[in-house]
Interface confidence: medium
């Protein structure tokens, strides 16, 4: 349905004029002016303000050519002076004014609000021309109008560079409350006070804000929107919505979840990413946060030995990204391992414990008693050592690696022998006469490979010259190693 | 204080239209829904529509759009229910009904002010 | 539409005695009220919001429930309460609904 526009003022003594669909008769009364050059604005009497001057809309032509007769003021003719409807329907409303013939290529533009309304609106202006004068009506209508077409709309014509106003007619939309501010949802902490805010508009003004709490309204009357509801503090999660009220009806806010902050709950599906000797690679599944942050989080490792103290090693690390390396563990060795993450609150309880083993470890200690002597008539260096002592962690021995460097003028090279765990000698063919050979032993396990013993170096002289006397590493105390030739 | 006055008993023939009234005093008439209810004789009560008179918007009950139909003079602040082809089954008393307050929506106090009915009875 | 369902239909009861007739929604509702009607009278807001007693009702009268389930309450009958009690239902849109009646008869 189209609302029309209707005027709903008082009766306000008119000049006839009549118009073609004209809403309202004329409104043309003016003072008596003498005779103008050009245009000037004529005091006239607002009908929506009786009594008081307005000048906004009137346009005085100069005389006619045969300077006889004034032609009348223009002046829009008044119309309803306000318009209101309901959101959704449809209106029309129209602005009217009669132009004498002798002016030409009037155009009526619309405004709303201080803007001209350009492009996509219905505006249509018709003439109906007569023997002295044209009445134009322009119409503005709007099709399922919204609160964003509220405003104060006003038809503007130009005429020789001169411009008249009409009177504003307001457009008012009414409808349920529309919400500006709704309240959001919040995780808050176990009986502690906090704030919501809910705020509706119009029109029709004022609105009325009810609180309501898990279905059950809060207060008791209403309060003028905007409205802020303290909460005291929770125990219990609860679900807050506001209802706002006009005269038009009621609108409800969306729900939203106040939550309690608690303490998270375990990670689960702790796993083990990669085990070496020393370190294991973990990764956890974060549980629920207990709607607060989790801030960090806590490993915790229990060397699994009957013989251990059972101490735990406690690593703290960030809650993200949820994996963790543990480092400075035994070899050859089997842990249990759990985390446990927290958030403001507090620590959640330590997730279901999982067994995890180190490997082998490399042999921490170097082959001991390294002897190094050179064979002249096989042209090779015998090397012997003494198997070293390594601890259980260190796995199984499954061999040793020998390496020998051959220095002489300006010439560097190094080689590496690998040999059985059952030897404990082993011989190396003389790669470079007339020059030093240092050999460094390292033991190995399927762990890697140890430290390499401290070099011993030997001498291995030009063809001809030949000492029998051996090099070898020094017994356990004893300053660095001696070069024997 | 706020009054609910309805125009007087109506004998309709079937099929023929009537149009009852409903004046408000005491309050600010185009500020407030007013509903229609209908109470054929020994029975319960049945919500027929509303209309706000500031603005003219109403709202129906599904079956009875079309057969009534609500509007409102704001200068007279009377509310009107008009009923067309009517059937011996329209035989009812017919009520105006407001809320109380302008704040906010009747649906949260309910009707407040009754006017004191309009007796239709549709015979041939 | 919610429809409302009164029970019982009709009930009597002596002076003094305690009353509770119910309504019952098909879903959920926002508002409940109850209405008083006395014959050849227009009815009269008794309760409204679930548990709020209108003005001059009697303190006898108590009303209470939520979401679909509603009822009205008379703490010690009295030879005036005899009259048939309506339950009205508004959610959030129209159509508006009314239960069909209890009567209540002084026994």
């Known amino acids: 349905a189209i609302t029309e526009a209707r005027e709903e003022a008082k009766p306000y003594p008119l000049f006839p004029g009549p118009l073609p669909g004209s809403l309202q008769t004329d409104h043309t009364s003016l003072l008596s002016l003498p005779h103008t050059s050009g245009y000037q604005p004529a005091l006239m009497f607002s009908p929506t303000q009786p009594g008081r001057p307005y000048t906004g809309n009137v346009a005085i032509p100069r005389v006619t050519s045969a300077g006889s007769k004034l032609l009348p003021p223009l002046a829009f003719k008044h119309t309803v002076g306000h318009i209101i409807l309901s959101e959704h329907k449809d209106v029309k409303f129209n602005c009217s004014i009669s132009v004498p013939n002798i002016y030409q290529d009037t155009t009526i533009s619309w405004w709303k609000d201080g803007k001209e309304l350009l492009g996509a609106h219905h505006a249509i202006t018709q003439f109906y021309p007569d023997d002295e004068v044209t009445a134009i009506i322009a119409s503005f209508s709007i099709t399922s109008v919204q609160r964003s077409d509220n405003g104060s709309y006003i038809c503007k014509m130009k005429i020789n560079n001169e411009e008249i106003v009409s009177d504003p007619i307001y457009i008012e939309v009414q409808g349920l409350p529309h919400f500006t501010k709704q309240p959001e949802s919040m995780n808050v902490t176990r009986n502690t006070a906090f704030n919501l805010t809910c705020q509706a508009v119009g029109p029709p003004e004022p609105v009325n804000i009810f609180w309501v709490q898990n279905s059950s309204r809060v207060n008791e009357q209403p309060e003028k929107s905007p409205s802020v509801l303290t909460v005291p503090g929770l125990t219990e999660m609860a679900v807050f919505s506001c209802e706002a009220h006009n005269d038009k009806g009621l609108t409800v806010s969306k729900g939203v979840q106040i939550n309690i902050k608690a303490i998270p709950s375990p990670p689960t599906e702790v796993s083990i990413h990669n085990s070496t000797a020393h370190s294991i690679l973990i990764s956890w599944v974060p549980g629920f946060d207990g709607y607060s942050p989790f801030r960090n989080c806590s490993v915790q490792v229990k060397e699994v030995d009957p013989l251990s103290n059972g101490s735990v090693m406690i690593f703290n690390t960030s809650a993200s990204p949820h994996m963790y390396q543990i480092k400075q563990l035994q070899a050859l060795a089997n842990y249990s391992i759990g985390v446990s993450c927290m958030n403001e609150i507090g620590w959640s309880a330590v997730s279901p414990w999982i067994l995890a083993s180190t490997t082998e470890g490399a042999p921490s200690v170097a082959p001991l008693n390294v002897t190094v002597f050179l064979n002249e008539s096989r042209d090779n260096v015998d090397i012997r050592w003494m198997k070293p002592l390594t601890k259980r962690q260190a796995g199984e021995l499954v061999g040793y690696r020998i390496s020998h460097v051959w220095q002489s003028a300006g010439i560097s090279k190094e080689l590496l022998e690998e040999v059985g765990q059952n030897n404990s000698r082993a011989q190396i063919s003389v790669q470079v006469h007339n020059a030093t050979c240092t050999v460094r032993i390292a033991a190995v396990t399927k762990g890697g490979v140890g430290p390499f013993s401290d070099p011993v170096k030997i001498f291995i002289p030009a063809h001809g010259w030949v000492d029998h006397a051996p090099s070898s590493t020094p017994a356990p105390g004893n300053a660095d190693p001696v070069l024997i030739i | 204080q706020v009054q609910l006055q309805q125009s007087g008993p109506e004998l309709v023939k079937p099929g023929a239209s009537v149009k009852i009234s409903c004046k408000a005093s005491?309050?600010?008439?185009?500020?407030?829904?007013m509903n229609w209810v209908k109470q054929r004789p020994g029975k319960g009560l049945e919500w027929i529509g509303r209309?706000?008179?500031?603005?003219?918007?109403?709202n129906y009950k599904g079956k009875l759009k079309g057969q009534a139909t609500l509007t409102a003079d704001k200068s007279s602040s009377t509310a009107y229910m008009q009923l067309s082809s009517l059937t011996f089954e329209d035989s009812a008393v017919y009520f105006c009904?407001?809320?109380?307050?302008?704040?906010?929506?009747?649906?949260?106090?309910?009707?407040?002010?009754w006017g004191q009915g309009t007796v239709v009875t549709v015979s041939a | 539409q919610i429809v409302l369902t009164q029970s019982p239909a009709i009930m009597s009861a002596s002076p003094g005695e305690e009353v509770t007739m119910t309504c019952s929604a098909s879903?959920?509702?926002?508002?409940m009220h109850w209405y008083q009607q006395k014959s050849g009278t227009s009815p009269k807001r008794w309760i409204y919001?679930?548990?709020k007693l209108a003005s001059g009702v009697s303190g006898r009268f108590s009303g209470s429930g939520s979401g679909t389930s509603y009822s009205l309450t008379i703490s010690s009958m009295e030879a005036e309460d005899a009259a048939t009690y309506y339950c009205?239902?508004?959610?959030?849109?129209?159509?508006?609904?009314f239960g069909a009646g209890t009567k209540l008869e002084l026994k």
């Open positions: 009904a407001r809320g109380g307050g302008y704040y906010y929506d009747s649906r949260y106090e309910g009707f407040v002010y």
């Open positions: 005491g309050y600010e008439f185009s500020r407030s829904w």
């Open positions: 209309i706000y008179p500031g603005d003219g918007d109403t």
């Open positions: 879903s959920s509702v926002s508002y």
């Open positions: 919001d679930t548990s």
């Open positions: 009205q239902q508004w959610s959030s849109n129209p159509p508006i609904t």
